[in-house]
Interface confidence: low
C-alpha cells in the first residue's frame, strides 16, 4: 500500500497511545541521557504533527518518511553536541546515512544508575498520574536497553501498571510489590537479551542468519505446521526485527500486529496452542504467541533419512534449490527435535550443508553422505556433556561459588577484558545453574545452550565497543552459531603480561558492610578478577584462601563499632595477607 | 473455559493435616492465577491462598501464614493445598478458583475470578 502521509498512516494504525509510547520508546533509545521532561517534550510535538497529517495528509512534511522527521527533531535539539558529542556529526549526514549513524551511537552500557525500587514513592507517582508513570517506566528502560523490542516494551509497561493497581491497594505495599517488581525485572532483562542477540544476528551475520534461527525455533515450537506456513512466518518476522533493530519502531510495532493477525485467522494450520493467545488483547496477543507452548508432534512422521539420505534425487534437489533445500531439512530436524538448542540444530544444519557440498561433486555421492546422520552426534555429545559436567560443579558450589569458578575460568581465557566486563559475564553465565540444571533432561540442552547465547552476545556486544582481546574477536564475529563452542574451547591465555598489584583496588571502605548480597558479591568477585589479571597462575588452593580471608575480613569490620576506622587499620594488613599468599 | 475439581476434602482431628487437590482442564494452569478460597457456614468466602500465573510468587491470608503451602505441578495440571496444624476455625468448604490472563496477578478478591470448582468439605473436629 502507498500512503502520502506515512506518519498518518502509523498513528491511524496504532492509535495514539501505543503511537505515544513507541515514539517515547524511539526518542529514549536515541537520547539516552536525556530528561524525561525533554522527551515528553518531543513526544508531544510528534504528536500534534502527526494528527495534523491525519486531518490532511497533504499538509506541509506530511509526505517525509519518519526518519527524516525523527531524525530532523533531534537535529533540532539545542543542545545535542553538547550532551552527546559526536552524535551531533550524524545531523551534517542525509538520509538514510544519518539514520544509520544516529544507529551506530546507540550505548549498550549507558551510564546510568541502577533503578531502586522505593515502593511508596513509586504507589505515591502511580496514583498521582497514571500516563506519566506509564511513560516513565517506558523511558527508563528504553535508555538503558536501547534494542529493546519496543512493542514487547509496551506489554511489559501494562503489566507493570497492573502489578502497581493491585498492590498499591494492599495494606503491605512492599510486600505485595518488591516479589513482583523482582520477577518483571527479570523478564525484561531476558527479553532485553533476547532482542539484543537477534538485533546482533541481523546487523552482524545478515538476514539470512535470522531467518535460519527462526526457522528452527518456530519449527520446534509449532511442528504441526507445514514447511511453507513456517517459511511465510519466518519471512514476516525477519521484517519486523529487522524494522525494530533498525529503529522503524512505529512500522515495526504495525507490521508485528499484522502478523498476530496472521497467525490468529491461520492458527488452525500453525499450532493447537494458540487458541488462547487468540482471544486477548494485541499487545498481550503477540506476547503470548511469543511464548507459546510447544504443539506436540504428528504421530506420522518418516524418519528423516527418508528425504535426507536415501532418497536418490538428494542431490538433484540439493542443487536445483539449495536454500529451500536445506530449509526443508532445518525444518524436518527441527520439528523432530524441541530436546535440542537452536544453536546445535543450526550447527547440525552446517554440517549437512558442508557434506553434500563435498559429496554432491564426487563420484559416487550417495556412497559419501551415506553416513551424514552418524556426524551429528559429536555435535549433540559435545554440550550434553559440557552441560553435565557443569551442572555438577553447580551442584556442588552452589549459585556462587560456580559464579566464581567461572569467573576464574573466564579471567584465565581473556585477560584483556576489562573486569566489569568479566564480572557481568560470569555472573551471567553462572545464572545458567539455577535456570537450568533443575529443568528435566530433555529440556537441559536447549535451556542452557540458548542461555548462554544471550550471555556471550552481551560479552561480543560490550568488547566490540572497545576491543581487547583478538580471541574474544574471533569468537564473536567467525560463526554466530559455534560462539559458544569456541568460548568453550578457549585455553588460559599464556601470552598475557600480569597487570601490575595496585593496593587501591583492594582498598574497602565502610559502605560494603550496607551493601545489598549481590553488591556484596560483585565487590568480592572484581576483587577475584584483579587479583587473577595480578596472578594469573594463581591456584585454586589459594583463591580458596585469599576469598576465605576477605569474608573474615569483612565480616570482623562490619561488626566492629567503627566500620571505616577498622578497615583503614585492617585494609592494609590483608593487602599484605593477599601478596604472602600469592607470593 | 477451565473445569476445576477439588478432591482431598474430609475430617480431621485439631493438629492434623490434609492436601487438598485441584485438577484443572481446559487451560495450563501455569498460565493462570490460581487460589484457593474459603467459605464456613453463614460466613464470607475468603482468600485463603494465590499463586500468579507464569510464576510461583505465592500469596497467604494471614490466618493460614506458616501453616497451609500452595503448590501447583504443572506436568499434571493440578493445583495444591498443603494444609498443616488444622484448627477447627479451619472448617469450610474449600474452592479452587482461577483467573486466566495476565501473569504475575492473583487476588484476594473472590469476583475477580471467572472460574471455580464445585469445593470441597473440610471438617476439623475432635
Known amino acids: 500500500d502507498t500512503y502520502k502521509s506515512e506518519i498518518a498512516h502509523r498513528f491511524k494504525d496504532l492509535g495514539e497511545q501505543y503511537f505515544k509510547g513507541l515514539v517515547l520508546i524511539a526518542f529514549s533509545q536515541h537520547l539516552q541521557q536525556c530528561p524525561y521532561e525533554e522527551h515528553v517534550k518531543l513526544v508531544r510535538e510528534v504528536t500534534e504533527f502527526a494528527k495534523t497529517c491525519v486531518a490532511d495528509e497533504s499538509a506541509e512534511n506530511c509526505d517525509k518518511s519518519i526518519h527524516t522527521l525523527f531524525g530532523d527533531k533531534l537535529c533540532a535539539i539545542p543542545s545535542l553536541r553538547e550532551h552527546y558529542g559526536d552524535l551531533a556529526d550524524c545531523c551534517e549526514k542525509e538520509e538514510p546515512e544519518r539514520n544509520e549513524c544516529f544507529l551506530q551511537h546507540k550505548n549498550d552500557n549507558p551510564d546510568i544508575p541502577k533503578l531502586k525500587p522505593d515502593p511508596v514513592a513509586l504507589c505515591a507517582d502511580f496514583q498521582e498520574d497514571e500516563q506519566k508513570f506509564w511513560g516513565k517506566y517506558l523511558y527508563e528502560i528504553a535508555r538503558r536497553h536501547p534494542y529493546f523490542y519496543a512493542p514487547e516494551l509496551l506489554y511489559y509497561a501494562i503489566i507493570y501498571k497492573d502489578v502497581f493497581s493491585e498492590c498499591c491497594q494492599a495494606a503491605d505495599k512492599a510486600a505485595c510489590l518488591l516479589p513482583k517488581i523482582e520477577h518483571l525485572r527479570e523478564k525484561v532483562l531476558t527479553s532485553a537479551a533476547k532482542q539484543r542477540l537477534k538485533c546482533a544476528s541481523i546487523q552482524k551475520f545478515g538476514e539470512r542468519a535470522f531467518k535460519a534461527w527462526s526457522l528452527a525455533r518456530l519449527s520446534q515450537r509449532f511442528p504441526k505446521a507445514d514447511f511453507t506456513e513456517i517459511s511465510k512466518i519466518v519471512t514476516d518476522l525477519a521484517k519486523v526485527h529487522k524494522e525494530c533493530c533498525h529503529g522503524d519502531l512505529l512500522e515495526c510495532a504495525d507490521d508485528r500486529a499484522d502478523l498476530a493477525k496472521y497467525i490468529c485467522e491461520n492458527q488452525d494450520t500453525i499450532s493447537t496452542k494458540l487458541k488462547e493467545c487468540c482471544d486477548k488483547p494485541l499487545l498481550e496477543k503477540s506476547h503470548c504467541i511469543a511464548e507459546a507452548k510447544r504443539d506436540e508432534l504428528p504421530a506420522d512422521l518418516n524418519p528423516l533419512e527418508h528425504d535426507f539420505v536415501e532418497d536418490k534425487e538428494v542431490c538433484k534437489n540439493y542443487k536445483e534449490a539449495k536454500h529451500v533445500f536445506l530449509g526443508t531439512f532445518l525444518y524436518e530436524y527441527s520439528r523432530r527435535h524441541p530436546d535440542y538448542s537452536v544453536s546445535l540444530l543450526l550447527r547440525i544444519a552446517k554440517i549437512y550443508e558442508a557434506t553434500l557440498e563435498d559429496c554432491c561433486a564426487k563420484e559416487d555421492p550417495p556412497a559419501c553422505y551415506a553416513t551424514v546422520f552418524d556426524k551429528f552426534q559429536p555435535l549433540v555429545d559435545e554440550p550434553k556433556n559440557l552441560i553435565k559436567q557443569n551442572c555438577e560443579l553447580f551442584e556442588k558450589l552452589g549459585e556462587y561459588g560456580f559464579q566464581n569458578a567461572l569467573i576464574v575460568r573466564y579471567t584465565k581465557k581473556v585477560p584483556q577484558v576489562s573486569t566489569p566486563t568479566l564480572v557481568e559475564v560470569a555472573r551471567k553465565l553462572g545464572l545458567v545453574g539455577s535456570r537450568c540444571c533443575k529443568r528435566p533432561e530433555e529440556e537441559r540442552l536447549s535451556c542452557a545452550e540458548d542461555y548462554l547465547s544471550l550471555v556471550l552476545n552481551r560479552l561480543c556486544v560490550l568488547h566490540e565497543k572497545t576491543p581487547v582481546s583478538e580471541k574474544v574477536t574471533k569468537c564473536c564475529t567467525e560463526s554466530l552459531v559455534n560462539r559458544r563452542p569456541c568460548f568453550s574451547a578457549l585455553t588460559p591465555d599464556e601470552t598475557y603480561k600480569p597487570k601490575e598489584f595496585v593496593e587501591g583496588t583492594f582498598t574497602f571502605h565502610a559502605d560494603l558492610c550496607t551493601l545489598p548480597e549481590d553488591e556484596k558479591q560483585i565487590k568480592k568477585q572484581t576483587a577475584l578478577v584483579e587479583l587473577l589479571k595480578h596472578k594469573p597462575h594463581a591456584t585454586e588452593e589459594q583463591l580458596r584462601t585469599v576469598l576465605g580471608n576477605f569474608a573474615a575480613f569483612v565480616q570482623k569490620c562490619c561488626a566492629a563499632p567503627d566500620h571505616e576506622a577498622c578497615f583503614a587499620v585492617e585494609g592494609p594488613k590483608f593487602v599484605i595477607e593477599i601478596r604472602g599468599i600469592l607470593a | 473455559e477451565v473445569q476445576l475439581l477439588e478432591s482431598g476434602g474430609g475430617l480431621v482431628q485439631p493438629g492434623g493435616s490434609l492436601r487438598l487437590s485441584c485438577a484443572a482442564s481446559g487451560r495450563y494452569i501455569d498460565e493462570t492465577a490460581v487460589a484457593w478460597f474459603r467459605q464456613a457456614p453463614g460466613k464470607e468466602r475468603e482468600f485463603v491462598a494465590g499463586i500468579g500465573g507464569g510464576v510461583d510468587i505465592t500469596y497467604y491470608a494471614d490466618s493460614v501464614k506458616g501453616r497451609f503451602t500452595i503448590s501447583r505441578d504443572n506436568s499434571k495440571n493440578t493445583l495444591y493445598l498443603q494444609m498443616n496444624s488444622l484448627r477447627p476455625e479451619d472448617t469450610a468448604v474449600y474452592y479452587c478458583?482461577?483467573?486466566?490472563?495476565?501473569?504475575?496477578?492473583?487476588?484476594?478478591?473472590?469476583?475477580?475470578?471467572?472460574?471455580w470448582g464445585q469445593g470441597t468439605l473440610v471438617t476439623v473436629s475432635s
Open positions: 478458583a482461577a483467573r486466566p490472563g495476565r501473569p504475575l496477578i492473583t487476588s484476594k478478591v473472590a469476583d475477580l475470578y471467572p472460574y
